[in-house]
């Protein structure tokens, strides 16, 4: 039994890091393998992650971690019984994929303005809380070409757009994702989408 693709890990910079790897053949990850991990820290202890299958030869492990700080470094040991298959390390702050924003809501009761709000996925004591920026994706269910991205580069988790920038009388969907420039993170997954019917009063034409 050998590792074909070495484990690569990403952290949510909060409490979970996800490591994925591939074996050289079909493997029952949960019964055959164990990923041991330990924070390099005087008061830390070793933890064991039981991997799950991720395709025939692929494995994935969700590591429960202490609150992440920038200096953290974890040792990783992949075992098959008594055999050490791979040994490595992982700095969570260098491989961050933020959590997805939640509670996306479209407020349509403001006159001819759409207000989209969502929740920051981090608690205020987390470093990323004040460092996230967002991308909002709005698209028409009727017209695949009617697809747009709004970059929200301020910290407030909201976006205002004129309802008239979208077509009236049809349904739209929106979703939002996050990233943090400070840690050069990847984008988060998209939030669940929310749907609304766009309607607004057309201005009277002057003849």
């Amino acid at each position: 039994m050998k590792v074909l693709q070495e484990p690569t890990c990403v952290s949510d910079y909060m409490s979970i890091s996800t490591c994925e790897w591939k074996m050289n053949g079909p493997t029952n990850c949960s019964t055959e393998l164990r990923l041991l991990y330990q924070l390099v820290f005087l008061l830390s202890e070793a933890h064991t992650c039981i991997p799950e299958n991720n395709g025939g030869a692929g494995c994935v492990c969700h590591l429960l971690m202490d609150d992440v700080v920038s200096a953290d470094n974890y040792t990783l040991d992949l075992w098959a019984g008594q055999q050490l298959l791979w040994k490595g390390s992982f700095k969570p702050s260098e491989h961050v994929k933020p959590r997805a924003p939640g509670n996306l809501t479209v407020h349509t009761n403001v006159s001819d303005t759409l207000l989209l709000t969502w929740s920051n996925p981090y608690p205020p004591d987390n470093y990323l809380y004040n460092h996230l920026t967002y991308a909002v994706n709005i698209w028409s269910e009727n017209d695949p070409a009617d697809f747009r991205i709004y970059n929200v580069t301020y910290l407030e988790p909201s976006l205002r757009i004129a309802a008239s920038t979208l077509k009236s009388g049809i349904s739209y969907r929106a979703r939002v994702r996050a990233w943090a420039q400070c840690y050069n993170t990847t984008w988060s997954e998209w939030s669940p989408s929310t749907k609304w019917h766009n309607s607004y009063r057309e201005p009277f034409e002057q003849h």
Partner: antibody
Framework: EVQLVQSGGGLVHPGGSLRLSCAGS????????MFWVRQAPGKGLEWVSG???????SYADSVKGRFTISRDNAKNSLYLQMNSLRAEDMAVYYC?????????WGQGTLVTVSS | EIVLTQSPGTLSLSPGERATLSCRAS???????LAWYQQKPGQAPRLLIY???SRAPGIPDRFSGSGSGTDFTLTISRLEPEDFAVYYC??????????FGQGTKVEIK
């Protein structure tokens, strides 16, 4: 807002015992290492003890065998049981949250050791 | 045990001046594990700088940290009245644990 609220200081005779408490809020207590740091009157800061998320502990040589650090994650609380107290243990004791450094501090509680 | 020595013991300056505080370690310290704190009379210390040069949340940019190995510096570019206090450096070592310097008092001249 992160808060650490301390209680339990006071006057004790040499050789006596005292238990300090520290209640945390505004953060996930169970995912954070916690510490006690003290400051003798007019002196600098001295690390006393620390406890990891899994319960691993460490002590300064000056208190080893006399002080015991513990935590109750269900109550978001940190404790320091101090036995066989000496005059040199007299200080303001701070609880702190952190790891390699201390991000947040309690308000401090004075422990006076005097006959 | 790693010993941290801070200098000067007292720094007498006027508001608006630049303050440079030194922290020297008896052996090499990882940049990642060097921090600075501010303490005012009757108050708990407050984290200013971690990782030798990163400002803690809410700390004004007039505070900056630098250095590596055994020599570290805290600089206050332009002293404000609220900056007069005692400053401590602190290090963490995987085997020796946590130690503080003895402190530098920044007082009004």
């Amino acid at each position: 807002e992160v808060q650490l609220v301390q209680s339990g200081g006071g006057l004790v005779h040499p050789g006596g015992s005292l238990r300090l408490s520290c209640a945390g809020s505004g953060f996930t207590f169970s995912r954070n290492a916690m510490f006690w740091v003290r400051q003798a009157p007019g002196k600098g800061l001295e690390w006393v003890s620390g406890i990891g998320t899994g319960g691993a502990t460490s002590y300064a040589d000056s208190v080893k065998g006399r002080f015991t650090i513990s935590r109750d994650n269900a109550k978001n609380s940190l404790y320091l049981q101090m036995n066989s107290l000496r005059a040199e243990d007299m200080a303001v004791y701070y609880c702190a949250r952190g790891r390699y450094w201390y991000n947040n501090w309690g308000q401090g509680t004075l422990v006076t050791v005097s006959s | 045990e790693i010993v941290l020595t801070q200098s000067p013991g007292t720094l007498s300056l006027s508001p608006g001046e630049r303050a440079t505080l030194s922290c020297r370690a008896s052996q090499s310290v990882s940049n990642s594990y060097l921090a600075w704190y501010q303490q005012k009379p009757g108050q708990a210390p407050r984290l200013l700088i971690y990782g030798a040069s990163s400002r803690a949340p809410g700390i004004p940019d007039r505070f900056s940290g630098s250095g590596s190995g055994t020599d570290f510096t805290l600089t206050i570019s332009r002293l404000e009245p609220e900056d007069f206090a005692v400053y401590y450096c602190q290090q963490y070592d995987h085997s020796a644990g946590w130690t503080f310097g003895q402190g530098t008092k920044v007082e009004i001249k």
